[in-house]
Interface confidence: low
Amino acid sequence: IPVIEPSVPELVVKPGATVTLRCVGNGSVEWDGPPSPHWTLYSDGSSSILSTNNATFQNTGTYRCTEPGDPLGGSAAIHLYVKDPARPWNVLAQEVVVFEDQDALLPCLLTDPVLEAGVSLVRVRGRPLMRHTNYSFSPWHGFTIHRAKFIQSQDYQCSALMGGRKVMSISIRLKVQKVIPGPPALTLVPAELVRIRGEAAQIVCSASSVDVNFDVFLQHNNTKLAIPQQSDFHNNRYQKVLTLNLDQVDFQHAGNYSCVASNVQGKHSTSMFFRVVESAYLNLSSEQNLIQEVTVGEGLNLKVMVEAYPGLQGFNWTYLGPFSDHQPEPKLANATTKDTYRHTFTLSLPRLKPSEAGRYSFLARNPGGWRALTFELTLRYPPEVSVIWTFINGSGTLLCAASGYPQPNVTWLQCSGHTDRCDEAQVLQVWDDPYPEVLSQEPFHKVTVQSLLTVETLEHNQTYECRAHNSVGSGSWAFIPISAGAHTHPPDE
């Protein structure tokens, strides 16, 4: 480690004095100190002499001697005070720039250590410091404002009491820069735009940042637009806004618009699409099949997507029959807007009743006219079965009627014993009827089919069962002959 002579931590001299500072090390040594006049430097191998014959207040400061070849980087220092009764301060810099939350050193060095008790930091024109300004003082280095804030960007002066009066330093301008987290925040409004040719339109591109130094521009396709910029400071952020006003849009105005903002941290951009159309439009569509089948008692939501410009002037859901004349309850109809020009309309049909099958139409209107989209809703029913004994063309016949939707399939079973339902152990015979006769098949109604089983003689102590099933469920009817002889003849005419 180098050694300084005189071997004291600090030296106090008067203006005009001769000062000699000698540094000796193992190898070559170098001096470092505040830039000030009148010093001469003499180096001789392992020693270096810094001297002046006419010390001034500007020579006040800390002088450090280092040994560049020393791997440990050792150094020695001495602080020199040149106590000028007229000049209590030596200001090393008149502008200090730091980032927010860093410590800001205002380098006003006291020229006389005796004055330390009466020093203070003030804003120019004697104004007090802002509340919550946390600072400390070192006679060797000056005032430090700790964790400086943007609002503390001010002009400061160091004050010292000399013989009952305050003597100020020249001013030091502190610039506290905001730590910019990234590129400016952007908004481009609207996110999408549609206009009919000849209408007016407005596109607003705005950018904001904690720091005023940023640029913003709006471009159409790849052309930068020349738009006057409005500036603002709001909510502790700087805002710059570009507003494009088009009195009468034409097809050449259509296309992609990008709002681009940049600062030292980088660039942000956001885009929107502007569509110019010849006339109003209204398009209805659904992601669902327009022909719907739902089991009775279950619920269904019918959804219609609407794309329209200008906005809708009216819309409603209508039940077109064929059953009751009821209309959908308004509370069951719901509208949501995805964006300005796209909407979804939903009709909720909970716990569907038989009378609610049929056609549901969504109608919408805008200046482009009326449009409608119609759903056909058919209800599914499990089969209902009934069996009767009759004579057809003189033959005893079991007649099974099955009603449901979709069309039921019919199977006959003959089983031993009297039972409500044949089980596998009892089954004697099974007949499938692949083509039962369709008795009725109207839209939105159940399909009724009939199946005939010719039985010459009804066996006593046996059960005849008609089973019907479809995709919803199954139904059955067990026919038990009461007296074998009673049903072998046609009834009396």
């Epitope: 802002m130 509340r131 919550h132 609002i151 409005q230 500036s231 603002d232 400071f233 709001h234 806004v241």
Partner: antibody
């Protein structure tokens, strides 16, 4: 000429929701830097700031009432609406809307109520 | 929240008197202060903004001063139409807060 006029019910019952409308003319709430605020003054008491809405739809509420207040604007009708839920007799006051003057930038971001409505007296009583 | 303490709460003065009203902020509001005049049954009227700027149309006998936390409204020569209640408002930070008011009455 800048004018603002408050309208709304003169009497509301406790627990009900108060809806006040401020209809203004002489300026537009789409103008950059423009805002409208609501202030109230209970009888014999000081003024109390309630809420502000700015041209860019930025909204600010008094934290002591924030959960009860909603401010919105309809620029096409030149209206600002304030709703206040769960009214209580202590909310009896004259309610004012006021314009927040445009920014004089970049010298300083001035923010002040420069034009006021005449106020509307709202009594909360069962 | 920034508290605004206004004093005095009331004062009696005569026409021609010099009147001073003060507002003390609980923290530095950096001159973001306005003064309003309020008469019974009337809307408040803006007198001073940004601590010392006189609003258009307001007589020059009204002036504002101060910095940091201490602000003053001065009426240099009280006129009959000046008898009213005066309020300060800080808009430095949300929530904006008014002072408690100073009622200027005829002595």
């Amino acid at each position: 000429e800048v004018t603002l006029k408050e309208s709304g019910p003169a009497l509301v019952k406790p627990t009900q929701t108060l809806t006040l409308t401020c209809t203004f003319s002489g300026f537009s709430l789409t103008t950059y830097g423009m805002g409208v605020g609501w202030i109230r003054q209970p009888p014999g008491k000081a003024l109390e700031w309630l809420a502000n809405i700015w041209w860019d739809d930025d909204k600010y509420y008094n934290p002591s009432l924030k959960n009860r207040l909603t401010i919105s604007k309809d620029t096409s009708k030149n209206q600002v609406v304030l709703t206040m839920t769960n009214m209580d007799p202590v909310d009896t006051a004259t309610y004012y809307c006021a314009r927040i003057g445009p920014i004089k930038y970049p010298t300083a971001p001035y923010r002040y109520f420069d034009f006021w409505g005449q106020g509307t007296m709202v009594t909360v009583s069962s | 929240d920034i508290q605004m303490t206004q004093s005095p709460s009331s004062l009696s003065a005569s026409v021609g008197d010099r009147v001073t009203i003060t507002c003390l902020a609980s923290e530095d509001i950096y001159d973001n202060l306005a003064w309003y005049q309020k008469k019974p049954g009337k809307a408040p009227k803006l007198l001073i903004y940004y601590a010392s700027s006189l609003q258009d149309g307001v007589p020059s006998r009204f002036s504002g001063s101060g910095s940091g936390t201490d602000y003053t409204l001065t009426i240099s020569s009280l006129q009959p139409e000046d008898f009213a209640t005066y309020y300060c408002l800080q808009d430095s930070e949300y929530p904006w807060t008014f002072g408690g008011g100073t009622k200027v009455e005829i002595k």
